[in-house]
C-alpha cells in the first residue's frame, strides 16, 4: 500500500495505490483512491508513467481529457467516471502489453488540495491450472495443464499423504510457446500416483502463484483451482 500526501500541509490530500499485476492480452486495473470532493468539476486525475513523455490518462471537469495522452496508451485507458466523485481514480487498462510494466503515478487535484502516489505495475501471463487423470499413460499418472504463463514459472507437485516429499524425480514439466510467441503453455506430468490421495500442482512466477488440486478415490474425483497475484502491496 502506498499512501501519498500533497506537498504543502493543509493543501495536501491522501492518495492510495495498490501494486498490482496485469495479464497480458487481457484488461487490467491500476488501483488508486483519494479523499473525495463534493464537486466532480473540481477533480483532476492524471496518470503518468515513468519514462513516458505523454500522459497515460487525464480526467478533468467530469470527462476525459486525452489531448496529451501518449501514443502507447491511445484507446486503451478509461477511468470509472461514475465512481470518481466517491474517490475512485482507478484506471482501466485494455489489452495489457508486456511493455506496460513499470512505475505509475496517480496524481490528484481537488478543491481540498493535491496528492499523488506511485504504483508498481508488473505484467506477465498467468492462468488457472487444471489437473486431470491421464488415462492414456502407461502408469498411474496425473497431468497438470495451464494455458498461459510468462515469465517461465516453476512447477512443484505436492501430496496430502506424502507431505514434504520431493516429486521432482517422478514428474516431468514442459513449456510450449503459444502462437503469439510470448506466453507459454505449461504441462506437468506426475507419475506413480496412488488412489485415495490429494495431489497439488503449484505453478509460480514472480507475478502469480496458482494451484490445481485433485483428489482421487474410487467413488469421486474432485478438482479445485485457485490463483493468487503476488506482491499486491498497497502504497
Amino acid at each position: 500500500l502506498i499512501i501519498g500526501f500533497g506537498i504543502s500541509g493543509r493543501h495536501s490530500i491522501t492518495v492510495t495505490t495498490v501494486a498490482s499485476a496485469g495479464n497480458i492480452g487481457e484488461d487490467g486495473i491500476l488501483s488508486c483512491t483519494f479523499e473525495p470532493d463534493i464537486k466532480l468539476s473540481d477533480i483532476v486525475i492524471q496518470w503518468l508513467k515513468e519514462g513516458v513523455l505523454g500522459l497515460v490518462h487525464e480526467f478533468k471537469e467530469g470527462k476525459d481529457e486525452l489531448s496529451e495522452q501518449d501514443e502507447m496508451f491511445r484507446g486503451r485507458t478509461a477511468v470509472f467516471a461514475d465512481q470518481v466523485i466517491v474517490g475512485n481514480a482507478s484506471l482501466r487498462l485494455k489489452n495489457v502489453q508486456l511493455t506496460d510494466a513499470g512505475t505509475y503515478k496517480c496524481y490528484i487535484i481537488t478543491s481540498k488540495g493535491k496528492g499523488n502516489a506511485n504504483l508498481e505495475y508488473k505484467t506477465g501471463a498467468f492462468s488457472m491450472p487444471e489437473v486431470n487423470v491421464d488415462y492414456n499413460a502407461s502408469s498411474e499418472t496425473l497431468r497438470c495443464e495451464a494455458p498461459r504463463w510468462f515469465p517461465q514459472p516453476t512447477v512443484v507437485w505436492a501430496s496430502q499423504v506424502d507431505q514434504g516429499a520431493n516429486f521432482s524425480e517422478v514428474s516431468n514439466t514442459s513449456f510450449e510457446l503459444n502462437s503469439e510467441n510470448v506466453t507459454m503453455k505449461v504441462v506437468s506430468v506426475l507419475y506413480n500416483v496412488t488412489i485415495n490421495n490429494t495431489y497439488s500442482c503449484m505453478i509460480e512466477n514472480d507475478i502469480a502463484k496458482a494451484t490445481g488440486d485433485i483428489k482421487v478415490t474410487e467413488s469421486e474425483i474432485k478438482r479445485r483451482s485457485h490463483l493468487q497475484l503476488l506482491n499486491s502491496k498497497a502504497s
Epitope: 488412489i195 474410487e218 467413488s219 474425483i221
Partner: antibody, heavy 119, light 108 residues
C-alpha cells in the same frame, strides 16, 4: 454404494437402431470415464466404448466404430449407447461399467441388458 | 492390439484346494492388469487391479502376481462360491481395452 442400472435392451431387426441407457448413483458420475462392455451368449467379455468424464473424448472398438455412439448427460447421471445399423453379431448382454479412479479397469458393473438382433 | 491369452480354458479343482490361473499378454503391459470373477447370470466383479492389488471387499484367499507379459491369479483354498469364470483384462494400451478368453473353474 455404487449402482449402475442399464435399460433399453430388447429384440431388434438387423439394420435397425436401439438406444441403451445406464443410470448411475452412489458416486460422482461427472468425474469418471464410463464404459460399455458386451458379452455374446456363452462367450467372453468384449470392450465396446469409453467416454471421458466431461464427454469430450470417445473411443470405440473397431467392431462398432462408425455404428455406435457413446454419450453422457452429467446433469442426469446417465450414460447412453446409441446403436445403429445393428447386426446379428451385436447380439449380447451389454454392461455399463465405471472406470477406475486412476486406470481403466472396471471397478463397478451394472447388471446388464440383453440386446437380441434377429429378423 | 494387445492379445490376452488365458490358460487353461477349464480348471477342475476340489473345494479347499489351491487354484492357479494364468494370463499372458502378447506384449509387455507392466502391471496394468485386472482380474474379474463372473458367476452365471451375473455381471463380472473386479477382484484384482494393478496385477496384485485386491479390490475392496475381496477376500485374502485371492492373490495376483506377475508383471510384463506373464500373470497369475491364485485362489489359495477354493470355497464353493469361488466356482465361476475368471477373466483377465489389460489397460496398458488402448483402444481397445482387451480381455482374455476366460478360465472356467469347476468342481472336480
Amino acid at each position: 454404494q455404487v449402482q449402475l442400472v442399464e435399460s433399453g435392451g430388447g429384440v431388434v431387426q438387423p439394420g435397425r437402431s436401439l438406444r441403451l441407457s445406464c443410470a448411475a448413483s452412489g458416486f460422482t458420475f461427472r468425474s469418471f470415464g464410463m464404459h460399455w462392455v458386451r458379452q455374446a451368449p456363452g462367450k467372453g467379455l468384449e470392450w465396446v466404448a469409453v467416454i471421458s468424464y466431461e464427454g469430450s473424448n470417445e473411443y470405440y472398438a473397431d467392431s462398432v466404430k462408425g455404428r455406435f455412439i457413446i454419450s453422457r448427460d452429467n446433469s442426469k447421471d446417465t450414460l447412453y449407447l446409441q446403436m445403429n445399423s445393428l447386426r446379428a453379431g451385436d447380439t449380447a448382454v451389454y454392461y455399463c461399467a465405471k472406470g477406475g479412479g486412476l486406470r481403466w479397469y472396471f471397478a463397478y458393473w451394472g447388471q446388464g441388458t440383453l440386446v437380441t438382433v434377429s429378423s | 492390439e494387445i492379445v490376452m491369452t488365458q490358460s487353461p480354458a477349464t480348471l477342475s479343482v476340489s473345494p479347499g484346494e489351491r487354484a492357479t490361473l494364468s494370463c499372458r499378454a502378447s506384449q509387455s503391459i507392466s502391471s496394468n492388469l485386472g482380474w474379474y470373477q463372473q458367476k452365471p447370470g451375473q455381471a463380472p466383479r473386479l477382484l484384482i487391479y494393478g496385477a496384485s492389488t485386491r479390490a475392496t471387499g475381496i477376500p485374502a484367499r485371492f492373490s495376483g502376481s506377475g508383471s510384463g507379459t506373464e500373470f497369475t491369479l491364485t485362489i489359495s483354498s477354493l470355497q464353493s462360491e469361488d466356482f465361476a469364470v475368471y477373466y483377465c483384462q489389460q489397460y496398458q494400451s488402448w483402444p481397445p481395452l482387451t480381455f482374455g478368453g476366460g478360465t472356467k473353474v469347476e468342481i472336480k
